[in-house]
Amino acid sequence: MDSFNYTTPDYGHYDDKDTLDLNTPVDKTSNTLRVPDILALVIFAVVFLVGVLGNALVVWVTAFEAKRTINAIWFLNLAVADFLSCLALPILFTSIVQHHHWPFGGAACSILPSLILLNMYASILLLATISADRFLLVFKPIWCQNFRGAGLAWIACAVAWGLALLLTIPSFLYRVVREEYFPPKVLCGVDYSHDKRRERAVAIVRLVLGFLWPLLTLTICYTFILLRTWSRRATRSTKTLKVVVAVVASFFIFWLPYQVTGIMMSFLEPSSPTFLLLKKLDSLCVSFAYINCCINPIIYVVAGQGFQGRLRKSLPSLLRNVLTEESVVRESKSFTRSTVDTMAQKTQAV
């Protein structure tokens, strides 16, 4: 069933107790949203405004450069993933406002949250791809001169999107609408029913491929880049460190609650107190993860402008300088202004 003949119910949220008292009225209402949900709504609103504008600007700037500069390809894909995620936020916002009621039908329940998940994972995996590119620029400059081209960059992006799609399939397949009898409400969520093992497997795969692996990639890549930077006594090593900390820390901080609660819920009984507590925090964890969708443009702009007062320039002009800079290796572009100088020193030295 794709849609329900849903009428605004007579009842709000209830905390059901185990006692049976048949002589009390049924019309006690409580329509207040929980504190975690209110916080989630605030975060969603901010992320939507900043994310849509910020990523739209990045897409606009990088789209013109994507044919000839590799960095523009990375940032274009990353911004598209974040931008698409942000577009789905009004749907999530509306659902939370209505106490998690889902008035958008079964098809929308399968597609929209899965699309959000697709884009979120695409963002993570693209960050890992960019990190690998940074690593190769520093440690394999000769290889980069020979093979690092726009075609390969697009293939890498396609692989990232493809893997993100694979990670999203279980969510799409198991997503269902459930119309609860009381309070009258349609919910959109995943239902593994008889297969708890499959639910756990999906959660573990999601944690490993969507969080731990990219985290490991980022950490290793930037650790080696940092070590090389320090060993060459690069003049801008502290600036590089700031970029590394910003990228890795934002990844860590904003995705950690979502992944931890997700894996915990897959191992808990749905009726357990811990599960119910985590479920109440679910929207907040999702909104917290969504900060990634608007933080990336901010990180790149702040790090890229190198605190040199370039904010006096127009924002598109600033972004163009940051996202489409030439690097020493062929036509490849640097990740940020801070790494450009250190890359130059390293490629000359290696």
């Epitope: 059901d16 006692t19 008292d21 006690k28 459930r178 119910l276």
Partner: antibody
């Protein structure tokens, strides 16, 4: 004591409509939802829908959508269930049942039932 | 819709026997509030159903202690510890978590 008294047996022709009543007593009528459940001969129980006597809000099972109408008369504490376009497979005993609740009044339980009304659809 | 499957569909037992009836839901019937609205009814021929157990394991007022319910998620059981002559009837499980509310097909308990 709580009582749900239903109207008498009905014999109807295919395509006709039937209206079954259920008079409540012994409790505050508007405080409890009223559901209708039917049972075909030798078969199990089948939920048809409910009515909230306080607001008039109704919810019908998809299977009966468009054919069933539930109404109430608060002055007489009576709920009505009308089923139209009758067919032979609608031959069943129709029960009205009150949904009780917990200490927040949530209507999660069918704690009291009417005696049942036999509806026979035959040409 | 949630399908409720009871087994066995009928069983013969003697007075004093311990009897177990199982009920399986086609999907999880855990409510978003954490409760499971799985109930059990007893029905005798020509009579309206009688409410026995609510929310998996809670006995309704006046229901003898020999009746007990258990289970979670999708699998549930009704146990009668020591059958009495008045217990021979048809038993139905029902879920009130999701719309439409659905019942099992019934388990007829007969005297051996």
């Amino acid at each position: 004591q709580v009582q749900l008294v239903q109207s008498g047996a009905e014999v109807k022709k295919p395509g006709a409509s039937v209206k079954v009543s259920c008079k409540a007593s012994g409790y505050t009528f508007t405080n409890y939802w009223m559901h209708w459940v039917r049972q075909a001969p030798g078969q199990g129980l089948e939920w048809m829908g409910y009515l909230n006597p306080s607001s008039g809000y109704t919810k019908y099972a998809q299977k009966f959508q468009g054919r069933v109408t539930m109404t109430r008369d608060t002055s007489t504490s009576t709920v009505y269930m009308e089923l139209s376009s009758l067919r032979s497979e609608d031959t069943a005993v129709y029960y009205c049942t009150r949904s009780g609740g917990d200490n927040y009044g949530n209507p999660y339980y069918f704690d009291r039932w009417g005696q049942g009304t036999t509806v026979t659809v035959s040409s | 819709d949630v399908q409720m499957t009871q087994s066995p569909s009928s069983l013969s037992a003697s007075v004093g026997d311990r009897v177990t009836i199982t009920c399986r839901a086609s999907q999880s019937i855990v409510h978003s509030n954490g409760n499971t609205y799985l109930h059990w009814y007893q029905q005798k021929p020509g009579k309206a159903p009688k409410f026995l157990i609510y929310k998996v394991s809670n006995r309704f007022s006046g229901v003898p202690s020999r009746f007990s319910g258990s289970g979670s998620g999708t699998d549930f059981t009704l146990t009668i510890s020591s059958l009495q002559p008045e217990d021979f009837a048809t038993y139905y499980c029902a879920q009130y978590t999701l719309v439409p509310l659905t019942f099992g097909q019934g388990t007829k308990l007969e005297i051996k």
